[in-house]
Amino acid sequence: SEVEYIAEVGQNAYLPCSYTPAPPGNLVPVCWGKGACPVFDCSNVVLRTDNRDVNDRTSGRYWLKGDFHKGDVSLTIENVTLADSGVYCCRIQIPGIMNDEKHNVKLVVIKPAKVTPAPTLQRDLTSAFPRMLTTGEHGPAETQTPGSLPDVNLTVSNFFCELQIFTLTNELRDSGATIR
């Protein structure tokens, strides 16, 4: 089953995918497609790279913002809509006989929660969660795996602020994550 990532409508979604070029700098073709990975290639290609650069992008909303030349081919989808929800395939076409690496990830786009303006609670989620929140401006430049997450801004209402922080602190303590 695919790892699930969540993004709010209007925000940027980040879908991680990476490989280690061997030797360094020896890039391989990669494709991203909407739909699970078929036997060959990617279905409904949204972005494709060759051995040097991105050479096929179906929309200006799809970007590789990581260090592509170090094998970070994580996909950023800008300004997501509900229609962007679904399974995406990252296929790394490592040269040779049937060497492809295939990764299916699921993007769930949700409507923004209707909350009143409130303090922003910054969470540093460093442990693995079954459903992962995703925002556009991911912090770390290093490869992001399903076990490490970008910073997430969580807005809570004034009324529930103390309760939310208390609950969240305990939740994160239980999971081994930190809060700042």
């Epitope: 060959f40 290639d41 990617c42 060759d50 076409q93």
Partner: antibody, heavy 119, light 107 residues
Framework: EVQLLESGGGLVQPGGSLRLSCAAS????????ISWVRQAPGKGLEWVAA????????YYADSVKGRFIISRDNSKNTLFLQMNSLRAEDTAVYYC????????????WGQGTLVTVSS | ETVLTQSPVTLSLSPGERATLSCRAS??????LAWYQQKPGQAPRLLIY???NRATGIPARFSGSGSGTDFTLTISSLEPEDFAVYYC?????????FGQGTKVEIK
């Protein structure tokens, strides 16, 4: 207009070799995955091998793995199938087929070339 | 491997009649299923891809449906040129496989 033209078929003895070619035109050859599919006389279709547009990645059916080699020359818009250690059961019409661009279907096929393996 | 079983093996119908062809997969193939038509001495021709999308130039009388393990190709009203063998193919699971074919013949 997309065209795929196979050649190189013929009669060969068991254990022998043959090299099939598929000349392509009417599309950007280097960007498309291409497959070889065969059809034994009076039988159904069997996928044989495929190669990515760059030629870097190849795929084979178990029945031909280690005996057949798929390759391409993008400068000449040509696909190849080197067939070694041929067996009677390799007798078939061999088609080259162009992927539709998403890996899930072939949208154009050549007319095929007949390979007969017999002593 | 994923076995595709087509039924019936032979379908005897008259021009103008509706033809319903079935393709059943031994495991889910999602929507990565295509239908091809083949006439004697000719190469296969793509009719339907991704289970329900009609290929370029294919008449509207051809339609595909289904997902997962059960798929159907429907020819709403048979024309004389539609009598041929029809194959389904899946490209979801390794290796790619074809069904054994359904022959649509004139009754």
């Amino acid at each position: 207009e997309v065209q795929l033209l196979e050649s190189g078929g013929g009669l060969v003895q068991p254990g022998g070799s043959l090299r099939l070619s598929c000349a392509a035109s009417g599309f950007t050859f280097r960007t498309h995955l291409i497959s070889w599919v065969r059809q034994a006389p009076g039988k159904g279709l069997e996928w044989v091998a495929a190669i990515t547009g760059s030629g870097g990645s190849t795929y084979y059916a178990d029945s031909v793995k280690g005996r057949f080699i798929i390759s391409r020359d993008n400068s000449k818009n040509t696909l190849f199938l080197q067939m070694n250690s041929l067996r009677a059961e390799d007798t078939a019409v061999y088609y080259c087929a162009k992927d539709g661009g998403s890996g899930s279907y072939d949208d154009f096929w050549g007319q095929g070339t007949l390979v007969t393996v017999s002593s | 491997e994923t076995v595709l079983t087509q039924s019936p093996v032979t379908l005897s119908l008259s021009p103008g009649e509706r033809a319903t062809l079935s393709c059943r997969a031994s495991q889910s193939v999602g929507s990565y299923l295509a239908w091809y038509q083949q006439k004697p001495g000719q190469a296969p021709r793509l009719l339907i891809y991704d289970a329900s999308n009609r290929a370029t130039g294919i008449p509207a009388r051809f339609s595909g449906s289904g997902s997962g393990t059960d798929f159907t190709l429907t020819i709403s009203s048979l024309e004389p040129e539609d009598f041929a063998v029809y194959y389904c193919q899946q490209r979801s699971n390794w290796p790619p496989t074809f069904g054994q074919g359904t022959k649509v013949e004139i009754k």
